[in-house]
């Protein structure tokens, strides 16, 4: 016996209670593919979630985060509170980056300053909570005997500004 359900298009479901008639999805539900025996409940964007795209009979709603929050996970499955630059979100809220680390975004974690000496370079601009250090020429390039087509910019002593 031929399965009549395969003829049911997206936006409908195959109603076994009605001799496999294709019935439209009820309000607040959808079916994105044909041949479905049930419609899925639409996603609701509540609380810190706001609606980016309304649910239709053939596609689920899409959510975004309200101002002050940003999306995490596939299809914005979570909303996480923003922090200020120079901070990270911990179990106890937004906390300033520890000395020697920075965060130049409203999200994510504080990351260590670049270690210029690992690349044989010197610190040109000190790091802050919001900005990484800027590495300059290597100390050897700055020595008086070193030949250079253009004189290098004066470099600061390695070290970091207090927070």
């Amino acid at each position: 016996l031929q399965d009549l359900c395969s003829n049911c298009p997206a936006g409908t479901f195959c109603d076994n209670n009605r001799s496999q008639i294709c019935s439209p999805c009820p309000p607040n539900s959808f079916s994105s593919a044909g041949g479905q025996r049930t419609c899925d409940i639409c996603r609701q964007c509540k609380g810190v979630f706001k609606t980016r795209k309304e649910c239709s009979s053939t596609s689920n709603a899409e959510c975004d985060c309200i101002s002050g929050y940003h999306c995490l996970g596939a299809e914005c499955s979570m909303c996480e509170q923003d922090c200020k630059q120079g901070q990270e979100l911990t179990k106890k809220g937004c906390k300033d980056c520890c000395f020697g680390t920075f965060n130049d975004q409203k999200r994510g974690i504080c990351r260590p300053w670049t270690n210029c000496s690992l690349d044989g370079k010197s610190v040109l601009v000190n790091g802050t909570k919001e900005r990484d250090v800027v590495c300059g020429p290597s100390p050897a390039d700055l020595s008086p005997g070193a030949s250079s087509a253009t004189p290098p910019a004066p470099a600061r002593e390695p070290g970091h500004s207090p927070q």
Partner: nanobody, 122 residues
Framework: EVQLVESGGGLVQPGGSLRLSCAAS????????MSWARQTPGKGFEWVSG???????YYTDSVKDRFTISRDNAKNTVYLQMNSLKPEDTAVYYC????????????????WGQGTQVTVSS
Amino acid sequence: EVQLVESGGGLVQPGGSLRLSCAASGFTFSSSAMSWARQTPGKGFEWVSGIYSDGSTYYTDSVKDRFTISRDNAKNTVYLQMNSLKPEDTAVYYCATWGTLRFGVWAEYDHWGQGTQVTVSS
């Protein structure tokens, strides 16, 4: 069907106290973490406090030592005791499930109440 119903909001003078309640139904309350959030025109939406199923509590800095979150699993209710209220605590307060267990983070599967207005003014 999951339901969260807040109550206890109202008008209070600065320095006063209020106790918000959130009655939960439609899910296993005793094993669920719960949270309170508030929404103000100025600061937007703010995570206020959370409580794990084991009773561990968390607060945002601005309410620490003034607000206390608690739960009564027998009554399926979570509370927010608010003392030493300030005008800047004026907001709509929402109760929500807190599946992520992470400060300032909610998931799409979390459920929300309709909110209760708290106004702190002389």
